[in-house]
């Protein structure tokens, strides 16, 4: 039994659970997902039993081996996978455990603006970046672009302090997860702060 193998997949994609077996005479191989049997292979008779019908189309063993390829991945395919190789030549089955994380492809992140104030010609507010569907394991980075700056800021919240008369700045939120990355529509400081020019404590989203 080797160490747990971590695998990553994307919704709609495929993942292969690699299995290299040194066992000479294999009686059966059983693949399990979260304690539920998934597939049983009996090499002798060339039998492959897929436990659940809905998985029949999604399960494959590429190149005639025993590595399991799972296609059309769904978010709820995330979990623990376990393979047991059973042989009369072994006292204990040879086992391997895998952890699969399935991530969604990220849509454009949405940006909302917090309470905005305008004091002494300086517009102060927070921009918050988030995914509409609450995707997990998303890392946010802000890019602040302008003649005077090209800065990155980590985290979903970007504090802004922009003085009227300064050169305009553009803010872009970049969202990433292990399988994809996307960016928000650009936000211009001047447009963002126009609403606060007349109203000292305005709030908008």
């Amino acid at each position: 039994s080797g160490p747990v193998k971590e695998l990553v997949g994307s919704v709609g994609g495929a993942v292969t659970f690699p299995l290299k077996s040194k066992v000479k005479q294999v009686d059966s191989i059983v693949w399990t997902f979260n304690t539920t049997p998934l597939v049983t292979i009996q090499p002798e008779g060339g039998t492959i039993i897929v436990t659940q019908n809905r998985n029949r189309e999604r399960v494959d063993f590429p190149d005639g081996g025993y590595s399991l390829k799972l296609s059309k991945l769904k978010k709820n395919d995330s979990g623990i996978y376990y393979v047991g190789i059973y042989s009369s030549s072994l006292q204990q089955p040879s086992t391997q455990e895998y952890v699969l994380h399935v991530y969604e492809h990220l849509s454009k992140p949405k940006v909302t603006m917090g309470l905005q104030s305008n004091k002494n010609g300086t517009c102060v507010t927070n921009l918050t970046c988030c995914m509409e569907h609450g995707e997990e394991d998303v890392i946010y980075t802000w890019k602040a672009l302008g003649q005077a700056a090209n800065e990155s800021h980590n985290g979903s919240i970007l504090p802004i302090s922009w003085r009227w008369g300064e050169s305009d700045m553009t803010f872009i939120c970049v969202a990433r997860n292990p399988v994809s990355r996307n960016f928000s529509s650009p936000i211009l400081a001047r447009k963002l702060c126009e609403g606060a020019a007349d109203d000292p404590d305005s709030s908008m989203v």
Epitope: S10, G13, R176
Partner: antibody, heavy 119, light 107 residues
Framework: EVKLLESGGGLVQPGGSLKLSCAAS????????MSWVRQAPGKGLEWIGE????????NYTPSLKDKFIISRDNAKNTLYLQMSKVRSEDTALYYC????????????WGAGTTVTVSS | DIVMTQSHKFMSTSVGDRVSITCKAS??????VAWYQQKPGQSPKLLIY???TRHTGVPDRFTGSGSGTDFTLTISNVQSEDLADYFC?????????FGGGTKLEIK
């Protein structure tokens, strides 16, 4: 020094196959998305596709999806492009490229490797 | 696919002049545009990204502008070493696409 070095190009017959490699050095290859871009003689640039750091996502230009396969080996710091069913219009200089800070624009390019499809 | 059109295949200019290279996207790409310079026999080199942000080490005579569908790379005080092909690239949506290129010739 950050470097990309392509290899594997050469003369291949129409309908044939070829595997290109791109050896990366001077940066943490396993953290970066990587792309292949090609340039036909005297022509513009054409993005072929990209692969994410752990190979779980590969995006292609739709017209090339069925004939090219992008893969990588992080242990060897190497990116690959498997070409199959090649035609004369695949004759080009093939570059591997790294996106700046994992964004979408490319700040590091290899010198390229030439593929010539001819009988 | 988004088509990036660089209407001028060639542009001629003199040392010290100012020249503008244009690129038109077939649909709105926001500011997700980069510009590259490719000198004869060399690989492309990143000049501009996010339509107007200069890449590290790029001389300030190179300026990018535009948003939506119309983009411009302006080179002021053109130098002889600016003789090259210039390409725009959109990265607003897959597949990423490049313009056909504009070859800058120095008189």
């Amino acid at each position: 020094e950050v470097k990309l070095l392509e290899s594997g190009g050469g003369l291949v017959q129409p309908g044939g196959s070829l595997k290109l490699s791109c050896a990366a050095s001077g940066f943490d290859f396993s953290r970066y998305w990587m792309s292949w871009v090609r340039q036909a003689p005297g022509k513009g640039l054409e993005w072929i596709g990209e692969i994410n750091p752990d190979s779980s996502t590969i995006n292609y230009t739709p017209s090339l999806k069925d004939k090219f396969i992008i893969s990588r080996d992080n242990a060897k710091n190497t990116l690959y492009l498997q070409m199959s069913k090649v035609r004369s219009e695949d004759t080009a200089l093939y570059y591997c490229a790294r996106p700046d800070g994992n964004y979408w624009y490319f700040d590091v390019w290899g010198a390229g490797t030439t593929v010539t499809v001819s009988s | 696919d988004i088509v990036m059109t660089q209407s001028h295949k060639f542009m001629s200019t003199s040392v010290g002049d100012r020249v503008s290279i244009t690129c038109k996207a077939s649909q709105d790409v926001g500011i997700a545009v980069a510009w590259y310079q490719q000198k004869p026999g060399q690989s492309p080199k990143l000049l501009i990204y996010w339509a107007s942000t200069r890449h590290t080490g790029v001389p300030d005579r190179f300026t990018g502008s535009g948003s939506g569908t119309d983009f411009t790379l302006t080179i002021s005080n053109v130098q002889s070493e600016d003789l090259a092909d210039y390409f725009c690239q959109q990265y607003s949506s897959y597949p990423y696409t490049f313009g056909g290129g504009t070859k800058l010739e120095i008189k």
